[in-house]
Amino acid sequence: MKVSAALLCLLLIAATFIPQGLAQPDAINAPVTCCYNFTNRKISVQRLASYRRITSSKCPKEAVIFKTIVAKEICADPKQKWVQDSMDHLDKQTQTPKT
């Protein structure tokens, strides 16, 4: 019982540091990160550093996770135009060689 209580405490503490709408990999099963809700605030590409697509069948919905310049992660809806435009912009930024 003590072990379960300690584990529960650890999980609660860990949950505090997880970005909104984002579920971290499950150590017991295959490592999958899923988004459960999306931001509805439009964020400028000026604040976005990178992104990754979430397409796993283990997740309830397809998503895009943006990483910001301050290393925060945001779940976004890939169907929204601003999200698509941001991904395009970041793709171009990556392709452009630094001079």
Epitope: S44, I69, V70
Partner: antibody
Framework: QVQLVQSGAEVKKPGASVKVSCKVS????????MHWVRQAPGKGLEWMGG????????MYAQKFQGRVTMTEDTSTDTAYMELSSLRSEDTAVYYC????????????WGQGTLVTVSS | DIVMTQSPDSLAVSLDERATINCKSS????????????LVWYQQKPGQPPKLLLY???IRESGVPDRFSGSGSGTDFTLTISSLQAEDVAVYYC?????????FGQGTKVEIK
């Protein structure tokens, strides 16, 4: 184009609270990250707090923590800033401010609301 | 918190002359991967809210005259008005847009000599 219209000037007694409103048009409030900035007479700009989409929550400047509450009524696209335990140093023009795509700065500003705290 | 310090507090410049305002941040606002400085400049005229002039330290907001320019990197930045016009009389503020809490400089008042 975002437009922000604020409520009118207020005169309050020390210890009282004030609630300033900011009505959004041109966008829905849930698309924006609304912030509040104040300016005491003849002084500079001071960020009080606002919705940070990178954290998914409202952030407050440490100076105002516990005394300020920022809320949103999404049905009317109106943002509110309530400041309690008012003192004379809180006499200032209070601005709501945002950007259509959140960028860490403010492209659109309300006209300002003068709050005077006087006994 | 990042502290923003402007200098001078005020300056008087003749019409058509150059005005230079400095802004120093207590820590770097340069994001190395994209080489962008997260520093913005505003202009505020009496009785009006601030107006965005420049972002990323040097990019003019649309509609801002090209006599306004910004330079600098890391912790030291400059706003230059190449040829001061009567309508440029205002208070100018820098703001770092990298980390919360967002912080402003104390402002620089520009007047005509």
């Amino acid at each position: 184009q975002v437009q922000l219209v604020q409520s009118g000037a207020e005169v309050k007694k020390p210890g009282a609270s004030v609630k300033v409103s900011c009505k959004v048009s041109g966008y829905t409030l849930t698309e924006l990250s609304m912030h509040w900035v104040r300016q005491a007479p003849g002084k500079g700009l001071e960020w009080m707090g606002g919705f940070d989409p990178e954290d998914g929550e409202t952030m407050y400047a440490q100076k105002f923590q516990g005394r300020v509450t920022m809320t949103e009524d999404t049905s009317t696209d109106t943002a509110y800033m309530e400041l309690s335990s008012l003192r004379s140093e809180d006499t200032a023009v209070y601005y709501c401010a945002t950007d259509d795509f959140w960028s860490g700065y403010f492209d659109y500003w309300g006209q300002g609301t003068l709050v005077t705290v006087s006994s | 918190d990042i502290v923003m310090t402007q200098s001078p507090d005020s300056l008087a410049v003749s019409l058509d002359e150059r005005a230079t305002i400095n802004c120093k941040s207590s820590q770097s606002v340069l994001y190395s991967p994209n080489q962008k400085n997260y520093l913005v400049w505003y202009q505020q005229k009496p009785g009006q809210p601030p107006k965005l002039l420049l972002y990323w330290a040097s990019i003019r907001e649309s509609g801002v005259p090209d006599r306004f320019s910004g330079s600098g990197s890391g912790t030291d930045f400059t706003l230059t008005i190449s040829s001061l016009q009567a309508e440029d009389v205002a208070v100018y503020y820098c703001q770092q847009s990298y980390f919360t809490p967002w912080t402003f400089g104390q402002g620089t008042k520009v007047e005509i000599k």
